[in-house]
């Protein structure tokens, strides 16, 4: 059965300066390959977080993604600014050179409210 990427919230609202959690769970870790978060779609989409590296200053993983059975790939964005508004997608890749996108969540739209 093919892996499914579940983003339960269609949208979240957050006040500027606060933090928000974007939820994402997978139904399987197979086939092996990375999980990444993007804002937007298509060629211009922006990488927000990758579970393969740890250099994303305002974004952290919520659960311990180093657990070998971990299926929770939710992220927390801190100190949200108006520029963070947009639709965020949790995306599962299959390993390769380059990695191949095989499944995306339905997206979670982030609305940023004035403080």
């Amino acid at each position: 059965t093919e892996v499914k990427v579940i983003q339960p919230e269609k949208s979240v609202s957050v006040a500027a300066g606060d933090s928000t959690v974007l939820n994402c769970t997978l139904t399987s870790l197979l086939p092996v390959g990375p999980i990444r978060w993007y804002r937007g779609v298509g060629q211009s989409r922006q990488l927000i977080y990758s579970f393969t590296t740890e250099h994303f200053p305002r974004v952290t993983n919520v659960s311990d993604a180093t657990k070998r059975s971990n299926l929770d790939f939710s992220i927390r964005i801190s100190n949200v600014t108006p520029e963070d508004a947009g639709t965020y997608y949790c995306v599962k890749f299959q390993r390769g050179s380059p990695d191949t996108e095989i499944q995306s969540g339905g997206g979670t739209e982030v609305y940023v409210l004035a403080k």
Partner: antibody, heavy 118, light 107 residues
Framework: DVQLVESGGAVVRPGESLRLSCAAS????????MSWVRQAPGKGLEWLAG????????YYIDSVKGRFTISRDNSENSLYLQMNSLTAEDTAVYYC???????????WGLGTLVTVSS | ALTQPASVSANPGETVKITCSGG??????YGWYQQKSPGSAPVTVI????KRPSDIPSRFSGSASGSAATLTITGVRVEDEAVYYC???????????FGAGTTLTVL
């Protein structure tokens, strides 16, 4: 610079216990899963056990399950391997290794020698 | 179990390929580790199939397809003489496995 330094290796008798330590520095220890790997004299590398970054999940090869326990203290940047009921087959150099995101290894310690002999 | 040749040899400047078979493309990631003498610390030359650590020379490369992984050393040098171990992480079983090691001799 990432540094992993093992200690605690010794000569022990069959049936005895030993606790190995691995002191980590140069990276955010609490963000990484860790593993223990050993090499018996004249043999190849053998993975023994792994532990998640938070320490809640542990994994073992069948041959050491129930005898060896991997643990960590993130406040001390330390990894441990408690070894019980040791036999001559456990004689080896024991290495700690930092795991990559997909549970392979990127950095290794220099190793500590455990000799089990009567 | 992961299978790799017991030994390979090459002249300086030649290209060496060491294969590692027995994994499953669907569930196994591969890495390669260099050990220059028994009991000395292994050095990671490739992880995640094809990722080379920043301090490893570019003559080392890795690839994976089907049920096998390959370590390629392009323009081998005398200092590359070592035992090379492949390792796999299996996402089904959560277990790591090493091959028996390949002794590279540079003639």
């Amino acid at each position: 610079d990432v540094q992993l330094v093992e200690s605690g290796g010794a000569v022990v008798r069959p049936g005895e216990s030993l606790r190995l330590s691995c002191a980590a520095s140069g990276f955010t220890f609490s963000s990484y899963a860790m593993s223990w790997v050993r090499q018996a004299p004249g043999k190849g590398l053998e993975w023994l056990a792994g532990i998640s970054a938070g320490g809640s999940d542990t994994y073992y090869i069948d041959s050491v399950k129930g005898r060896f326990t991997i643990s960590r203290d993130n406040s001390e940047n330390s990894l441990y391997l408690q070894m019980n009921s040791l036999t001559a087959e456990d004689t080896a150099v024991y290495y700690c290794a930092r795991e990559t995101w997909n549970h392979l290894f990127d950095y290794w310690g220099l190793g500590t020698l455990v000799t089990v002999s009567s | 179990a992961l299978t790799q040749p017991a030994s390979v040899s090459a002249n300086p400047g030649e290209t060496v390929k060491i294969t590692c078979s027995g994994g499953d493309w669907y569930s196994t990631y591969y890495g390669w580790y260099q050990q220059k003498s028994p009991g000395s610390a292994p050095v990671t030359v490739i992880h995640s199939d094809d990722k080379r650590p920043s301090d490893i020379p570019s003559r080392f490369s890795g690839s994976a397809s089907g049920s096998a992984a390959t370590l390629t050393i392009t323009g081998v040098r005398v200092e590359d003489e070592a035992v090379y171990y492949c390792a796999g992480y299996d996402g089904r079983t959560y277990i790591n496995t090493f091959g028996a090691g390949t002794t590279l001799t540079v003639l």
